[in-house]
């Protein structure tokens, strides 16, 4: 419990730099006041920090810059020499990925059997971070330039690039604007808006003989 890592920021774009500090409290009885603070990213070789100094309260601090984080998830360890080995002081988790690209190829079909408007899209490249997709919509007129009543959001389930708007939220023979919003810890994006009347995109079932 002698050490503590601070990371700024804990979630970055893949390839971006990360700054970290490791502090050792002055009342850490088991450590030498001149202990050399060491660092290890994942299972890479142990390395010293960029610089180490004493703070006014006696705390030792080591600073390190990881110039390019090329792991999508990694642990950063702060260590000190201990007898013939090293002692772990603290670990902190890093994540890296990308902000979501704009979802594309949004299309919708009105399913009369399930009585819902089912929309699907392509999510874009892998972000390596939890990314939510929300189907957003509002009622409008033919060109969808005017924003009428909003329709409750439809949150897509994980790894499912589709969502269903139930009949109760639809006004048939009335135009609506529909689009997808993608969001993760690094940013958000939106697909181009689709302007449609649900009755124009009815999926007809094959006739029963």
């Amino acid at each position: 419990s002698c050490g503590h890592i601070e990371i700024s920021p804990p979630v970055v774009r893949l390839g971006d730099p990360v700054l970290a500090s490791c502090t050792i409290s002055p009342n850490c009885s088991k450590l030498d006041q001149q202990a050399k603070i060491l660092w290890r990213l994942q299972d890479e070789p142990i390395q010293p920090g960029d610089r180490q100094h004493h703070l006014p309260d006696g705390t030792q601090e080591s600073l390190i810059t990881l110039p390019h984080l090329n792991y999508t998830q990694a642990f950063l360890f702060c260590l000190v020499p201990w007898e013939d080995s090293v002692q772990l002081l603290d670990q902190a988790e890093l994540h890296a990925g990308y902000p979501p690209a704009s979802p594309s190829n949004l299309s919708c079909l009105m399913h009369l059997t399930t009585n819902s408007l089912v929309c699907q899209w392509e999510p874009g490249p892998e972000t390596h971070l939890p990314t939510s997709f929300i189907l957003k919509s509002f009622r409008s007129r033919a060109d969808c330039q005017y924003q009428g009543d909003t329709i409750p959001d439809c949150v897509a389930k994980k790894r499912q690039n589709n969502c269903s708007i139930p009949r109760k939220n639809l006004l048939l023979y009335q135009y609506m604007a529909i689009w997808v919003q993608a969001e993760n810890m690094l940013g958000s994006s939106e697909s181009p808006k689709l302007c449609l009347d649900p009755m124009d995109v009815v999926k007809l079932e094959p006739p029963m003989l």
């Epitope: 419990s1 990694a74 971070l129 810890m185």
Partner: antibody, heavy 120, light 107 residues
């Protein structure tokens, strides 16, 4: 539904072995480091082990170091804990847990737990 | 290791009561404190992370405060489903450690 489901617990004699499994569903398992936490009967929670996304980095509590081995199979969305040389003090409910990204080891998803009883 | 001490270890309260649970760390842990709720035979559930951030889906009657060594979990108006055991957890330093728990019982 986001879910973790442990299995493999049971009654074992001191010195024996068990392998616990934790099956993940409803989230992208390969994005997350995973943890094992245990709770002795009527007691509090104790961290046991953690593993990074690739399986290349493992950490253990001093109380289990050298006896327990954590591993994962991302293709099967499954986390494992191999427990050898079991002792009476290892008797506990074992939970797997997933941390919330962007927080510092706050666990937002837990399994229902599997009971391990070490007794002769 | 950092010791986490919760008080009280148990308390009796009625529906509608304001309940406060405290957690004290053996050394400063900044705001690296999380709170969990656990019901008998169930897994813990994350309520609060980073001392005061409410986890998604958790009712707003739960709130957390504090920094350094002293932290508080407050339930503004106790509901029947809130009778459970509450744990604090520090994530400041290795190993991560938990408090011994506070059991909230029906008066």
């Amino acid at each position: 539904e986001v879910q973790l489901l442990e299995s493999g617990g049971g009654l074992v004699q001191p010195g024996g072995s068990l392998r616990l499994s934790c099956a993940a569903s409803g989230f992208t398992f390969s994005y997350y480091a995973m943890w094992w936490v245990r709770q002795a009967p009527g007691k509090g929670l104790e961290w046991v082990s953690l593993i990074d996304v690739s399986g290349g980095v493992q950490l253990y509590a001093d109380s289990v170091k050298g006896r327990f081995t954590i591993s994962r199979d991302n293709s099967k969305n499954t986390l494992y804990l191999q427990m050898n040389s079991l002792r009476a003090e290892d008797t506990a409910v074992y939970y797997c847990a997933k941390p919330l990204i962007g927080t510092r080891d706050a666990f937002d998803i837990w399994g229902q737990g599997t009971m391990v009883t070490v007794s002769s | 290791d950092i010791q986490m001490t919760q008080s009280p270890s148990s308390l009796s309260a009625s529906v509608g009561d304001r309940v406060t649970i405290t957690c004290r760390a053996s050394q400063s842990i900044s705001s690296y404190l999380n709170w969990y709720q656990q019901k008998p035979g169930k897994a813990p559930k994350l309520l609060i992370y980073a001392a005061s951030s409410l986890q998604s889906g958790v009712p707003s009657r739960f709130s957390g405060s504090g920094s350094g060594t002293d932290f508080t979990l407050t339930i503004s108006s106790l509901q029947p489903e809130d009778f459970a055991t509450y744990y604090c957890q520090q994530s400041y330093s290795t190993p991560r450690t938990f408090g011994q728990g506070t059991k909230v019982e029906i008066k």
